[in-house]
C-alpha cells in the first residue's frame, strides 16, 4: 500500500493531457498535482476519463480546497459538475452568470438534479435578486423555474425582469402566483401600444382586476376563449355582456361551448337574461326579467 | 423530461378521505415544488393546491381547510391528502413539476 503512494519514476504529470487516461485510479491519485489540476480543469472535458478516474481528481479538488472550490475551477469543472453534491456545492460562491451557463450547459437534457437545484439557490441567494439575465438563463434551461417560486419569491422579481418570461414560462403557474406576476408585467409593459402590449401582458392575464379587463375591453384586443377562460372568475363577473362582447370580439361566439365552465358559467348566473339573449348565442341561466338584483357584498361592505 | 407518476386515486364516498402521491423519476430534485391540478368531466382543468420552491403552500379556496400537500425530498414525492370529499371533487388529478405533467389517476366520490 505504502508503495502505491508514491509516483512511479517518470510518471509525474507536467500536464493535464491524454496521456492519463492510461493511468490507474493510484497513479493519478500520486502522480498529478492537485494545483495544476486545478489551473488546468478546462483541458479535463476534452479528456474521456472513466468515471472512477474523475472520483480521484474530484478527491484531488477536495483536498486542496476543503472550504469549497474557487469560481475559477468551478466555472471549468465541466463533467466533473456531475460528480458534486448538493454538501459540496453548498461551499461555493458563484457570481458570474457564466460560471452557471457552463454548468446549466453540463446537465441539459437531463432532469432537474439536486446538485442544479442546489447551485441555482447559491446563485440567486448570492445575487440578492432574480435580475432579468438570471431569469432569462434559468427559463431557458428550465421553463418551469418562474412557477416553481413561492408568491412571496415572486414578489421579489423586478419588474424589468418580465421581458425574458416566454408564455410557456407561465404555462404551470397558478392563480396566486399570477396575481403576484401580472401588476409586475403591466409595469414592464406600460409603454407599449395596445396590440403589442396585450401580445406581451396575455400570459399574465390570470392575476388581471376587473378594471384593467373593463380598460381592455375598450381596446378592439379579440381576447381568444383559452385566454378568457383563465381569467379570475372575481374579476370577470362584474363585467357586463356588452363589455365581454367587447373583450372577445369575434371570439364571443366561443361562449355557447363554455357555459357550463368556470369562469362563463359563474358569470352568465349574474347577467340579466334580455342582456345575454342580445348576444345571439342561445346563453341560458341568466336571471330572468322583473328580478331585483341585491349586491349582497356591497351591503356587508357597507355594514 | 421529468418523469411523474401519480398514485393513490380510487373510489370513495362522500366525507371520505383519500391520499395522492406524486413521484419524480430518478435523480430529480423535488426541491422546486409541485402542483396539483384537476379535470373534472365537461370542465376545463383547475388548479388544487401548490407547493413552492421554499416550502410554502397555496390552495384554491374550494379545497381550503380539506386538502392538505405536503412533499418529502427524500422519497422525491409529493403528497396531496383529501379529507371531507364532496361530490365535486371527482376527477383526474394532475400532478405537475417544473413544466412536466402526469398521467393522472382518478378520484371518483360517490353518494
Known amino acids: 500500500e505504502v508503495e502505491k503512494t508514491a509516483c512511479p519514476s517518470g510518471k509525474k504529470a507536467r500536464e493535464i493531457d491524454e496521456s492519463l487516461i492510461f493511468y490507474k485510479k493510484w497513479e493519478l491519485e500520486a502522480c498529478v498535482d492537485a494545483a495544476l489540476l486545478a489551473t488546468q480543469m478546462d483541458r479535463v472535458n476534452a479528456i474521456p476519463f472513466t468515471y472512477e478516474q474523475l472520483d480521484v481528481l474530484k478527491h484531488k479538488l477536495d483536498e486542496l480546497y476543503p472550504q469549497g472550490y474557487p469560481e475559477s475551477v468551478i466555472q471549468h469543472l465541466g463533467y466533473l459538475f456531475l460528480k458534486m453534491s448538493p454538501e459540496d456545492i453548498r461551499k461555493w460562491n458563484v457570481t458570474s452568470l457564466e460560471t452557471l451557463k457552463a454548468l446549466l450547459e453540463v446537465n441539459k437534457g437531463h432532469e432537474m438534479s439536486p446538485q442544479v437545484a442546489t447551485l441555482i439557490d447559491r446563485f440567486v441567494k448570492g445575487r440578492g435578486q432574480l435580475d432579468k439575465d438570471t431569469l432569462d438563463t434559468l427559463t431557458a434551461f428550465y421553463p418551469g423555474y418562474l412557477c416553481s417560486l413561492s408568491p412571496e419569491e415572486l414578489s421579489s422579481v423586478p419588474p424589468s425582469s418580465i421581458w425574458a418570461v416566454r408564455p410557456q414560462d407561465l404555462d404551470t403557474c397558478d392563480p396566486r402566483q399570477l396575481d403576484v406576476l401580472y401588476p409586475k408585467a403591466r409595469l414592464a409593459f406600460q409603454n407599449m401600444n395596445g396590440s403589442e402590449y396585450f401580445v406581451k401582458i396575455q400570459s399574465f392575464l390570470g392575476g388581471a382586476p376587473t378594471e384593467d379587463l373593463k380598460a381592455l375591453s375598450q381596446q378592439n384586443v379579440s381576447m381568444d376563449l383559452a385566454t378568457f377562460m383563465k381569467l379570475r372568475t372575481d374579476a370577470v363577473l362584474p363585467l357586463t355582456v356588452a363589455e365581454v362582447q367587447k373583450l372577445l370580439g369575434p371570439h364571443v361566439e366561443g361562449l355557447k361551448a363554455e357555459e357550463r365552465h368556470r369562469p362563463v358559467r359563474d358569470w352568465i348566473l349574474r347577467q340579466r337574461q334580455d342582456d345575454l339573449d342580445t348576444l345571439g348565442l342561445g346563453l341560458q341561466g341568466g336571471i330572468p326579467n322583473g328580478y331585483l338584483v341585491l349586491d349582497l357584498s356591497m351591503q356587508e361592505a357597507l355594514s | 423530461q421529468l418523469q411523474l407518476v401519480e398514485s393513490g386515486g380510487g373510489l370513495v364516498q362522500a366525507g371520505g378521505s383519500l391520499r395522492l402521491s406524486c413521484t419524480a423519476s430518478?435523480?430529480?430534485?423535488?426541491?422546486?415544488?409541485a402542483k396539483w391540478f384537476r379535470r373534472a368531466p365537461g370542465k376545463e382543468r383547475e388548479w388544487v393546491a401548490s407547493?413552492?420552491?421554499?416550502?410554502?403552500?397555496g390552495y384554491d379556496d374550494s379545497v381550503k381547510g380539506r386538502f392538505t400537500i405536503s412533499r418529502d425530498l427524500a422519497k422525491n414525492t409529493v403528497y396531496l391528502q383529501m379529507n371531507s370529499l364532496r361530490l365535486e371533487d371527482t376527477a383526474v388529478y394532475y400532478c405537475?413539476?417544473?413544466?412536466?405533467w402526469g398521467q393522472g389517476t382518478q378520484v371518483t366520490v360517490s353518494s
Open positions: 430518478g435523480s430529480t430534485s423535488m426541491s422546486y415544488g
Open positions: 405537475t413539476a417544473l413544466n412536466s
Open positions: 407547493v413552492y420552491r421554499d416550502g410554502t403552500t
